[in-house]
Amino acid sequence: MMTGTIETTGNISAEKGGSIILQCHLSSTTAQVTQVNWEQQDQLLAICNADLGWHISPSFKDRVAPGPGLGLTLQSLTVNDTGEYFCIYHTYPDGTYTGRIFLEVLESSVAEHGARFQIP
């Protein structure tokens, strides 16, 4: 039975040209995390394999930095980066857990972080 929960940074906003940390955390399970995939709608941003380390997709190589931890730092933000991001935790023996983050990239300096929330 899958008992874990994914905690994410939730709905977040950031300024155009700035950077943002996409972060998820898996809790309430003893399952081993074998890999975390980061996706944006229909394309892969990055993969962190627990043994091998990081793969960064070529579309994002210039402006994505791995970490902190299993998170992802997205730099040089544009308004086109607005949208849903998913962290997909592959675990053993539980299976797959998915967290969702909505990022809004703003033109002005009114960007503020949203509250954290949990996805069961």
């Epitope: 229909d42 892969l44 993969i47 394999n49 627990a50 380390g53 791995p66």
Partner: antibody
Framework: VQLQESGAELVKPGASVKLSCRAS????????VYWVKQRPGQGLEWIGG????????TFNEKFKNKATLTVDTSSSTAYMQLSSLTSEDSAIYYC????????????WGQGTLVTVSA | DIVMTQSHKFISTSVGDRVSITCKAS??????VVWYQQKPGQSPKLLIY???YRYTGVPDRFTGSGSGTDFTFTISSVQAEDLAVYYC?????????FGGGTKLEIK
């Protein structure tokens, strides 16, 4: 960039063999090394990969009790030991190198033919 | 394990023709797909990755597309030297798996 693999091996069933892959033309610890199996006239099968900077390895479960992956950073060489060999292990084994921060197999060695026969 | 299915084992074509090879993943693999070319008696070579980026030195007649479960590799104008087996491969989740290969034959 070059990946130079060891020569062909003829081994007896039940024995072990250690294949080597010497890397040159780049910083060995910056790129993952992977191993791929190809049976004669057949397709490709991923065995596993190793991160030379920390020795971390990941495997195709099918090969977990068959293959052992190691590296020697001082000689920029990756090794794969195959144990308890059977005729099913007769194949060409390739070592490959990834892209920077990439899981793609960007460079390939020439392959080592392993023949298991009594 | 994710199964990568290349529906055609063989494709027969003529020099100058446009040819497409398809690859279907048994489950979602996002854009974590790569295409390799293996000429007779040679090691495979990386052609296309992620799945529309041409690797360094690869001629622009080779292109790739797709996302999710359906992927296509295209040669816009086949040349005699393109005689080879073409493999798709996913690296979305281990074990990374290859398609069975499609052999391109030149008429």
């Amino acid at each position: 960039v070059q990946l130079q693999e060891s020569g062909a091996e003829l081994v007896k069933p039940g024995a072990s063999v250690k294949l080597s892959c010497r890397a040159s033309g780049y910083t060995f610890t910056d790129y993952f090394v992977y191993w791929v199996k190809q049976r004669p006239g057949q397709g490709l099968e991923w065995i596993g990969g190793i991160n030379p900077s920390n020795g971390g390895a990941t495997f195709n479960e099918k090969f977990k009790n068959k293959a052992t992956l190691t590296v020697d950073t001082s000689s920029s060489t990756a090794y794969m030991q195959l144990s308890s060999l059977t005729s099913e292990d007769s194949a060409i084994y390739y070592c490959t190198r990834g892209n920077f921060y990439g899981y793609e197999f960007a460079y390939w060695g020439q392959g080592t033919l392993v023949t298991v026969s009594a | 394990d994710i199964v990568m299915t290349q529906s055609h084992k063989f494709i027969s074509t003529s020099v100058g023709d446009r040819v497409s090879i398809t690859c279907k993943a048994s489950q979602h693999v996002s854009t974590a797909v790569v295409w390799y070319q293996q000429k007779p008696g040679q090691s495979p070579k990386l052609l296309i990755y992620s799945p529309s980026y041409r690797y360094t030195g690869v001629p622009d007649r080779f292109t790739g597309s797709g996302s999710g479960t359906d992927f296509t590799f295209t040669i816009s104008s086949v040349q005699a030297e393109d005689l080879a087996v073409y493999y798709c491969q996913q690296h979305y989740i281990t074990p990374w798996t290859f398609g069975g290969g499609t052999k391109l034959e030149i008429k």
